[in-house]
């Protein structure tokens, strides 16, 4: 039975040219996380973090995507095209798959701030 829940940074905004942390956190389960996949709004896979084999970033994003903190993902040099949905998929054993959603809005305005609901140390 799947008892866990995914908390995410929810709806966030950041300014063009800046950076943002996408963060998901799986709680209320003792399941082992075997792999975390980070997908963009168009179903393209940005990154994988495999428990044994580490982080893998798709080459097209290598200059703008950094692994971490933790199981999260940092997007850098943001453009307006980065606006949209992002999904974290947690593959766990024995529970199965958990999925979280984050909406990122990239703003032209210099007053845009990135405020996450929580931060994983």
């Amino acid at each position: 039975m799947m008892t866990g829940t995914i908390e995410t940074t929810g709806n966030i905004s950041a300014k063009k040219g800046g950076s943002v942390i996408l963060q998901c956190h799986l709680s209320s389960t003792m399941a082992q996380v075997t792999q975390v996949n980070w997908e963009q709004h168009d179903h393209s896979l940005l990154a994988i973090r495999n428990a044994e084999l580490g982080w893998h970033i798709y080459p097209a994003f290598k200059d703008r995507v950094a692994p971490g903190p933790g199981l999260g993902l940092t997007l850098q040099s943001l453009t307006m095209n980065d606006t949209g949905e992002y999904f974290c998929t947690y593959h766990t054993y024995p529970d199965g798959t958990y999925r979280g959603r984050i909406f990122l809005e990239v703003l032209e305005s210099s007053v845009a701030e990135h405020s996450a609901r929580f931060q994983i140390p």
Partner: antibody, heavy 117, light 106 residues
Framework: EVQLVQSGAEVKKPGASVKVSCKAS????????IYWVRQAPGQRLEIMGR????????YYVDKFKNRATLTADTSASTAYMELSSLRSEDTAVYFC??????????WGQGTLVTVSS | DIQLTQSPSFLSASVGDRVTITCKGS??????LVWYQQKPGKAPKLLIY???NLQSGIPSRFSGSGSGTEYTLTISSLQPEDFATYFC????????FGQGTKVEIK
């Protein structure tokens, strides 16, 4: 043209070690991780581990953590896989392969390692 | 990790035949599926990535399709150089390979 060229076949006694090399050309060696994958007779391909030549960082599948050692010589654009305490079930073809993001795009030709007393 | 099962394991066909190989996952593969061709004593060759994207330089007679847990590799008209072993690989959950399908001359 991207190429991965591996060392030749080896015959080893049980308990011995083997070291297989993989020379890369046609791309910047430090930009892509190298994986080592093996295929025992009649078995499916099995991942052993990964090395990032840029920083020498290694990752091993649990099964091979204590027996496999992956290294890389960036000056020679060559990756190495050493497997110790060989047993008959280690008889297999060993491949090095470059990972492009999440899948393997270029492979070495394979090195047959036979473990026999 | 997802287990991949290919069918059939062996296939006898003639030049010009249309050939279909199936790869089934124990869980949803989410289209993160790749096909390789391997000939004896040679390096595996990447044919198709992300279910249906043909790798550069691969003839258009090769195509891939599928979703969820079921994926297929189709060779529209088998050529003499296509007799080989084909295997699938997934990276949606773990990095795992199918057991291979050997395509032999009938």
């Amino acid at each position: 043209e991207v190429q991965l060229v591996q060392s030749g076949a080896e015959v080893k006694k049980p308990g011995a070690s083997v070291k297989v090399s993989c020379k890369a050309s046609g791309y910047t060696f430090t930009e892509y991780s190298i994986y080592w994958v093996r295929q025992a007779p009649g078995q499916r391909l099995e991942i052993m581990g990964r090395i990032d030549p840029k920083n020498g960082r290694t990752y091993y599948v649990d099964k091979f953590k204590n027996r496999a050692t992956l290294t890389a010589d960036t000056s020679a654009s060559t990756a190495y896989m050493e497997l110790s305490s060989l047993r008959s079930e280690d008889t297999a073809v060993y491949f090095c392969t470059r990972i492009y993001g999440f899948y393997f795009d270029f492979w070495g030709q394979g090195t047959l390692v036979t473990v026999s007393s | 990790d997802i287990q991949l099962t290919q069918s059939p394991s062996f296939l006898s066909a003639s030049v010009g035949d249309r050939v279909t190989i199936t790869c089934k996952g124990s869980q949803n593969v989410n289209k993160y599926l790749v096909w390789y061709q391997q000939k004896p004593g040679k390096a595996p060759k990447l044919l198709i990535y992300n279910t249906d994207n043909l790798q550069s330089g691969i003839p258009s007679r090769f195509s891939g399709s599928g979703s969820g847990t079921e994926y297929t590799l189709t060779i529209s008209s088998l050529q003499p150089e296509d007799f080989a072993t084909y295997f699938c690989y997934q990276y949606n959950n773990g990095f795992t390979f199918g057991q291979g399908t050997k395509v032999e001359i009938k």
